[in-house]
């Protein structure tokens, strides 16, 4: 190989050992029989050399640095050449570095030809191995603007006082052009301006200078986004930190077309604007930091550009002004991530503050719109708390657990509407009375409705799930001892049509000791399946539940258990079941940890089934499934 550098090129070539590998045999640069491991060639010099091994690319790297002085004379503006040409260099991983020094008052602009650049974060790498590292200068301090790959949106980077651009090419890469040019501009009066051009839909992730380290103190950095007028842009902050400011405030400023309040100033913790039409600028402004404990300012954000959807021009009013202790969250439903570009799906408050999820709270009227290609990608979760603090005031009071019509009119599917029902401990209990009798969801008879009620304890320490219940069954009411959550969960878009079937009333009733009581009024000719709470995990220790089963005068109820034995093994206490005729008070007691479960039994009158658990050994839980079937008395049952 021969490298001869023109005298006035201001180029230095450095060949040095790269990252050490576990290769057994060392490799050397050979010059006139001398073996060396580092070679520096400066302007005007000529060196002829070879390598002592077959694959020098596994051992050595080459750096080509060109110093461009714009201080003492005119700057060589225009397209930047790869000099020396890559064809003249040994096939090593190579880094071309251009170090441009200019006066503080001179603006320098790097212009990138297509493909434009895509910024990458720490730990990321470029698929083709070609990286562009760009840094600027503040007095003597080097500031990293960022590391970039090809195939992105960044078209221009403007800086002041100097710029250092490093282009890293893997040894096998055929690239023989720099892909950028340098132009002079008037002073930009800030650290840098990054221009990002969107031709169509797409996204760009960008970072503050020095990311993930701190943004330079009291500096200003601007991103200019060029967006076709027919598309919409939304900004979301992926990661940020604030420093400790002594004077001024760290903020972002937007220049948004058509806005009457330019610049729009936001705190970094605010929701950022969305649904913006056309070009806009975003600036990050630092502050004077506390000398003792400066902290760091850093920002990583994403700009998503996509077509406006039909929904984006519709405003929906969600009136929660008459609600109390309620929050509504619209968020993306979980999906498998695809590798191709997926347009963003945003919900916007007042048409401008858009984000992938939005929580609305009670006490206000909210105006929302959507910026989303497919609203089925979103769903709604609502939480409402109904609490009673004074038992004298609440007793016998009733509340309707119904989804407000405002929410049902939104174009987004309701996933969960949860009511947290709170009562004063040991003073009151709760009763749930459905508008339509409920069916308990079991494997034997699953619910096939568009929604269900999930009833569970709302006491943090208690793991008690009563079950999933849907309209169209035999459960007339559910009484529970203490705090519960009732969640209306929808399973199909047809819920909108079936919404009239929802309706549950909760009343506060005198306190009782049992964990739950189910009142069951079976219908003729239908088999009612019932199962103990916490199915699959076992009824909690020392918990007692009852079923009050009504048998009409002209009917006989057949009670059938679906196992021979309960399977429970008690560590302490006893597990038992009581079946009691309500008219005669006659009862049968079964030891669930010892006895065989009863064979099918016939009941001519209403009866109770009470199941009480012991403290079971782990893995030997109490799960019981039973059914009740009514048949007319005239049938001979012998």
């Amino acid at each position: 190989f021969e490298i001869a550098l023109p005298r006035e090129s201001n180029i230095t070539v450095l060949i040095k050992l790269g990252t050490p590998t576990l290769l057994a045999k060392p490799c050397y640069i050979v010059i006139s029989k001398r073996h060396i491991t580092m070679l520096s060639i400066k302007s005007g010099e000529r060196i002829v050399f070879t390598f002592s091994c077959q694959s020098p690319e596994n051992h050595f790297v080459i750096e080509i640095q060109k110093n461009i002085d714009c201080m003492s004379g005119p700057c060589p503006f225009g397209e930047v050449q790869l000099q020396p040409s890559t064809s003249l260099l040994p096939t090593l991983n190579r880094t071309f570095i251009w170090d441009v020094k200019a006066h503080k008052s001179i603006g320098l602009e790097l212009q990138f030809s297509i493909p434009r650049l895509r910024q990458i974060g720490p730990g990321e790498s470029c698929p083709d191995g070609v990286t562009h590292s760009i840094s600027g200068r503040i007095d003597a301090t080097v500031v990293r603007i960022g590391t970039f790959c090809s195939n992105g949106t960044v078209s221009r980077i403007k800086m002041q006082e100097g710029v250092k651009m490093a282009l890293h090419l893997p040894w096998f890469h055929p690239r023989n052009v720099s892909g950028f040019s340098i132009a002079n501009r008037s002073s930009i009066k800030r650290l840098c301006i990054i221009e990002s051009v969107f031709e169509g839909e797409g996204s760009a992730t960008l970072m503050s200078a020095n990311y993930p380290e701190g943004f330079p103190e009291d500096e200003l950095m601007t991103w200019q986004f060029v967006v076709p007028a027919h598309l919409r842009a939304s900004v979301s902050f992926l990661n940020f930190n604030l420093s400790n400011c002594e004077r001024k405030e760290e903020r972002v400023e937007y220049y948004i077309p058509g806005s009457t309040t330019n610049p729009e100033v936001f705190k970094l913790e605010d929701k950022q604007p969305g649904n913006m039409a056309g070009n806009f600028n975003l600036s990050l402004q630092g502050c004077d930091q506390d000398a003792q404990s400066p902290g760091i300012l850093r920002l990583q954000f994403q700009v998503l550009v996509q077509h406006p959807q039909n929904e984006s021009n519709k405003i929906y009013v969600v009136d929660l002004s008459n609600e109390r202790a309620m929050s509504l969250t619209i968020e993306p439903r979980p999906v498998k991530q695809s590798r191709k570009f997926v347009p963003g799906c945003f919900v916007c408050l007042e048409s401008r503050t858009c984000s992938s999820n939005l929580t609305l709270t009670s006490g206000s009227k909210h105006k929302i719109s959507f910026l989303c290609d497919d609203l089925t990608r979103l769903w709604m979760n609502v939480e409402k708390t109904i609490s009673c603090t004074d038992h004298r005031y609440c007793q016998r009071k009733s509340y309707s657990l119904q989804v407000p019509s405002d929410i049902l009119h939104l174009p987004v599917e309701l996933h969960d509407f949860s009511w947290k029902l709170l009562v004063p401990k040991d003073r009151l209990s709760l009763v749930l009375v459905p508008a339509q009798k409920l069916q308990q969801h079991t494997h034997e008879k699953p619910c096939n409705t568009s929604f269900s009620y999930l009833v569970a304890s709302a006491i943090p320490s208690q793991d008690l799930y009563f079950g999933s219940f849907c309209p169209g069954g035999s459960i007339k009411q559910i009484q529970v001892k203490q705090n519960i959550s009732v969640t209306l969960r929808t399973f199909a878009p047809s819920f909108q049509q079936e919404a009239s079937r929802q309706g549950l009333t909760v009343s506060f009733i005198p306190y009782f000791k049992e964990e739950g009581v189910f009142t069951v009024t079976p219908d003729t000719k239908s088999k009612v399946y019932l199962r103990t709470p916490n199915w699959d995990r076992g009824l909690p220790s020392l918990t007692s539940v009852s079923w009050n089963i009504s048998v009409p005068r002209d009917q006989v109820a057949c009670l059938t258990f679906f196992k021979e034995r309960s399977g429970v093994v008690c560590q302490t206490g006893r597990a038992f079941m009581i079946i009691q005729e309500q008219r005669t008070r006659a009862e049968e007691i079964f030891s669930l940890d010892e006895d065989v479960l009863p064979k099918p039994s016939f009941h001519h009158h209403s009866f109770w089934v009470n199941i009480s658990n012991c403290s079971p050994t782990s893995g030997k839980q109490l799960d019981l499934l039973f059914s009740v079937t009514l048949t007319p008395r005239t049938v001979d049952l012998t």
């Epitope: 010059i31 001398r34 005007g44 010099e45 060196i47 002829v48």
Partner: antibody
Framework: EVQLVESGGGLVQPGGSLRLSCAAS????????MSWVRQAPGKGLEWVAN????????DYVDSVKGRFTISRDNAKNSLYLQMNSLRAEDTAVYYC?????????????WGQGTLVTVSS | DIVMTQSPLSLPVTPGEPASISCRSS???????????LDWYLQKPGQSPQLLIF???NRASGVPDRFSGSGSGTDFTLKISRVEAEDVGIYYC?????????FGGGTKVEIK
């Protein structure tokens, strides 16, 4: 045997032009950098210009920049020096020299020289 | 540009006696390769210059071993262990590190 033979020297008036040639033989001309070195009467040696193997890179001493042009024709195994705007101080014997194929700018072979006299 | 300074200007010698010529450069000629990019040339009367020493201390082919080069950085020496009559002429040092290539003023070696 390596041979370099210069020609084209002579008497020329100040401001005039002259084209020197160097015919190379006995080696692969296209594989070597080539230079012109001059020596004013009774004075020392002064490097003038050089040209890369393929003619893509050229360098000159400051005193001749913009007036002299070095070139080569590898097909003809020839090196040239086009001298314009000649001055009295350009009077010298002009040697054609081969740069050795080693590191640095070492001349391993020289021609016998051709005299250029600039005088009115 | 690198300036080369040679001394003495003239060196009268007795055949069979040693001779020494000094050359100094305005900046170091020691390269990162470990070589000193300095050459010595001899121009015999009425002839073209010929290469004697390259890279500071390496003799060119066909050069008698009575010629040797030494030195590093900015100070270099050419020694002739026993001068012979055919060694007369002007000796030039040249920095071969970077363009523009520059020569010393020359040292004229003549027989006493």
């Amino acid at each position: 045997e390596v041979q370099l033979v210069e020609s084209g020297g002579g008497l020329v008036q100040p401001g005039g032009s002259l084209r020197l040639s160097c015919a190379a033989s006995g080696f692969t001309f296209s594989s070597y950098w080539m230079s012109w070195v001059r020596q004013a009467p009774g004075k020392g040696l002064e490097w003038v210009a050089n040209v890369k193997q393929d003619g893509s890179e050229k360098d000159y001493v400051d005193s001749v920049k913009g007036r002299f042009t070095i070139s080569r024709d590898n097909a003809k195994n020839s090196l040239y020096l086009q001298m314009n705007s000649l001055r009295a101080e350009d009077t010298a014997v002009y040697y054609c020299a081969r740069e050795w194929n080693s590191s640095g700018w070492t001349f391993d072979y020289w021609g016998q020289g051709t005299l250029v006299t600039v005088s009115s | 540009d690198i300036v080369m300074t040679q001394s003495p200007l003239s060196l009268p010698v007795t055949p069979g006696e040693p001779a020494s010529i000094s050359c100094r450069s305005s900046q170091s000629l020691l390269h990162s390769t470990g070589y000193n990019f300095l050459d010595w040339y001899l121009q015999k009367p009425g002839q073209s210059p010929q290469l004697l020493i390259f890279l500071g201390s390496n003799r060119a082919s066909g050069v008698p071993d009575r010629f040797s080069g030494s030195g590093s950085g900015t100070d270099f020496t050419l020694k002739i262990s026993r001068v012979e009559a055919e060694d007369v002429g002007i000796y030039y040092c040249m920095q071969a590190l970077q363009t523009p290539l520059t020569f010393g003023g020359g040292t004229k070696v003549e027989i006493k």
